[in-house]
């Protein structure tokens, strides 16, 4: 079921080999998976209450964002 | 509206099958990943499974792993929880749940689980 | 497996007390704590995710704070709404574990 040897060293640490292209790194498995069907509703900032505008975002721009970004929820995945 | 409606609890013997449904509302379904989790009577909350957005990948609690099997129908919407080899440890009200992710760069974080079917118990009794 | 302890196992509020919960994890577990209200009868409802984000529609009244091992949801002033079983979840790695649950109850 596993997608292969590439993973991080532990929760917090970089990446040493980023997933290939159209992949993400799920922290909860450990392993990279499909980054298909991203439909992302914006956060919000902690403690806030009122719901969060939507929005889409493809999937080349995800895997392409910086990992220094703000965490975007994120439907599907797993 | 987001929702998860649950069928197939029952009762049965143990040593016996029982199939559990979950039907989302709408076509967001497609795109979730899932859980199965259950609550035995008076006791703590206990995660059985999880399964991907198209069903590629699956894992399962240790106390059902071998018996039970998660899988999906994305073109009817549907979470399947298939329970095999009862036991009456497995008596329990199971809730459905729709896996909550962010997207970090190119790092998913989980957070839980937000949206929740309204529960089937399953007794297994002789 | 990492344990979630959770504490009180149970507890007495009056309407518009200050309440605080604690979940200790066996290891460290970064912000990868959710919290969840349940009442007789009903499924869990999310209220905190990542330990300190609030989800949407939930009152501000509802807090939660704290990394690693230790973690506290605080309910700021208690409503009559409030008193159910509340449980925090970790979600850094499978097996994905629950607390035992903190029943909040009327005095």
């Known amino acids: 079921m596993r997608r292969g040897p590439r993973s991080l060293r532990g929760r917090d640490a970089p990446a040493p080999t980023p997933c290939v292209p159209a992949e993400c790194f799920d922290l909860l498995v450990r392993h990279c998976v499909a980054c298909g069907l991203l439909r992302t509703p914006r956060p919000k900032p902690a403690g806030a209450s009122s719901p969060a505008p939507r929005t889409a975002l493809q999937p080349q721009e995800s895997v392409g964002a910086g990992a220094g970004e703000a965490a975007l929820p994120l439907p599907g995945l797993l | 509206e987001v929702q998860l409606v649950q069928s197939g609890g029952g009762v049965v013997q143990p040593g016996r099958s029982l199939r559990l449904s979950c039907a989302a509302s709408g076509e967001w379904f497609s795109s979730y990943g899932m859980h199965w989790v259950r609550q035995a009577p008076g006791k703590c909350l206990e995660w059985v499974a999880v399964?991907?957005?198209?069903?590629?990948?699956?894992y399962y609690g240790d106390s059902v792993k071998g018996r039970f099997t998660i899988s999906r129908d994305n073109s009817k919407n549907t979470l399947y929880l298939q329970m095999n080899s009862l036991r009456d440890e497995d008596t329990a009200v199971y809730y459905c749940?729709?896996?909550?992710?962010?997207?970090?760069?190119?790092?998913?974080?989980?957070?839980?689980?937000?949206?929740w079917g309204q529960g089937t118990t399953v007794t297994v009794s002789s | 497996e990492i344990v979630l302890t959770q504490s009180p196992s149970s507890l007495s509020a009056s309407v518009g007390d200050r309440v605080t919960i604690t979940c200790r994890a066996s290891?460290?577990?970064?912000?990868?704590l959710n919290w969840y209200q349940q009442k007789p009868g009903k499924a869990p409802k999310l209220l905190i995710y990542a330990a300190s984000s609030l989800q949407s529609g939930v009152p501000s009244r509802f807090s939660g704070s704290g990394s690693g091992t230790d973690f506290t949801l605080t309910i700021s002033s208690l409503q009559p709404e409030d008193f159910a079983t509340y449980y925090c979840q970790q979600s850094y790695s499978t097996p994905l574990t629950f607390g035992c649950g903190t029943k909040v109850e009327i005095k």
């Open positions: 399964i991907w957005y198209d069903g590629s990948n699956k």
């Open positions: 290891q460290s577990i970064s912000s990868y």
């Open positions: 749940a729709r896996r909550f992710t962010h997207l970090r760069g190119w790092i998913i974080e989980d957070y839980g689980m937000d949206v």
